[in-house]
């Protein structure tokens, strides 16, 4: 019986530890996509509607803030699209990029952790164009560090929650 009690306590401890594991999945807020034709920071994301969820991390001022030291898996998926009903592209040669950036407040510094993308030729003869970028990686993050997303050509972003999103989840503690 003692072994059973110990086992259930162990399960509970494991489960509460799992429940405390930080994670976030943030989806683009389509009502507030910034304008610009060069690299801009995306600061408006949902954290609590649709597929978006956050736990033991903080979303503030457009940045995902780490609350616990650890090794995290970071990911971002960005979709760009253009349909002729919205008008014409002013240029057919495009650089479609995403940058995942880490900012440290304690030692003021900023680093690009991941970038992805391509130069594209989107011909005016086509009715519809689409391009998707997915980046992901494993990083050591400290409490207080902030993760943000920058993209080129935000006016071409696909605003759907299954198209443009980013997130993080803690994989293990720092030894």
């Amino acid at each position: 019986e003692k072994a059973m009690v110990d086992g259930s306590w162990l399960d509970l401890a494991k489960r509460s530890k799992l429940e405390a594991q930080p994670f976030a999945h943030l989806t683009i807020n389509a009502t507030d996509i910034p304008s610009g034709s060069h690299k801009v920071s995306l600061s408006s994301w949902y954290h609590d509607r649709g597929w978006a969820k956050i736990s033991n991390m903080t979303f503030s001022n457009g940045k995902l803030i780490v609350n616990q030291d650890g090794f995290y898996y970071l990911y971002a998926n960005i979709c760009f699209r253009h349909h002729e009903t919205s008008g014409d592209l002013a240029t057919e040669y495009l650089q479609l990029m995403v940058y995942v950036t880490k900012t440290s407040i304690k030692i003021p510094s900023s680093h690009t952790l991941m970038k992805g993308g391509s130069t594209k030729y989107w011909s005016g003869n086509s009715e519809f164009h689409f391009y998707s970028i997915n980046v992901g990686g494993f990083f050591k993050l400290r409490s207080g560090e902030e993760i943000s997303i920058e993209v080129s050509n935000p006016s071409l972003l696909d605003p759907d929650q299954d198209a443009t999103y980013f997130g993080a989840f803690k994989v293990r503690d720092i030894d």
Partner: antibody, heavy 126, light 103 residues
Framework: QVQLVQSGAEVRKPGASVKVSCKAS????????IHWVRQAPGQRLEWMGW????????KFSQKFQGRITVTRDTAASTAYMELRSLRSEDTAVYYC???????????????????WGQGTLVTVSS | EIVMTQSPSSLSASVGDRVTITCRAS??????LNWYQLKPGKAPRLLIY???SLQSGVPSRFSGSGSGAEFTLTISSLQPEDIATYYC?????FGQGTKVEIK
Amino acid sequence: QVQLVQSGAEVRKPGASVKVSCKASGYDFSNYAIHWVRQAPGQRLEWMGWINAGNGNTKFSQKFQGRITVTRDTAASTAYMELRSLRSEDTAVYYCARDESNMVRGIIIAYYFDYWGQGTLVTVSS
Amino acid sequence: EIVMTQSPSSLSASVGDRVTITCRASQSISRYLNWYQLKPGKAPRLLIYGASSLQSGVPSRFSGSGSGAEFTLTISSLQPEDIATYYCQHTRAFGQGTKVEIK
């Protein structure tokens, strides 16, 4: 304030060419596209083409492809539309119009014509 | 190629009347629809963009509605200065125009 001032009326014989100018003022010419639209007597407005004043990129209606050239002089903040091999059906009022989309804000030419020139009457007659 | 069709082609109304002009697209164009006012010898004027947004400086008696393939321009109280031809437009395609006159 934003203004587009076009050149004066022109009369041409069939087979000739005409070049209409459109001088912009009151805004940063290079940050916007200029469209050319015409209206023949008793007809609807007809889009002809656009030029991105910043990079010189152009797009034309299939109908005018091969007969139309649109250029710009950024130093003079002026766009030009030349139509060749004129025929009587080309008799119309030709307008230039600014696209509302600022190329610094994004790269989509949205076809919102927020400012127009006063129009240039081109008459093609033998 | 998208075709825009306006109705009626002309109308006559009294000052103060509510006037409605309809524009249909041959396929769905979301809300990418603009309305212009054209007076003889004058530069055309953008009234409504994006189906329902009032262009700066345009009197509030003008309003636009609709999405998909059917759109409406409404003048809530017709004024003498509203005598003109009105055109709907989606990117490269214009409607054939509606001539508005005073009774």
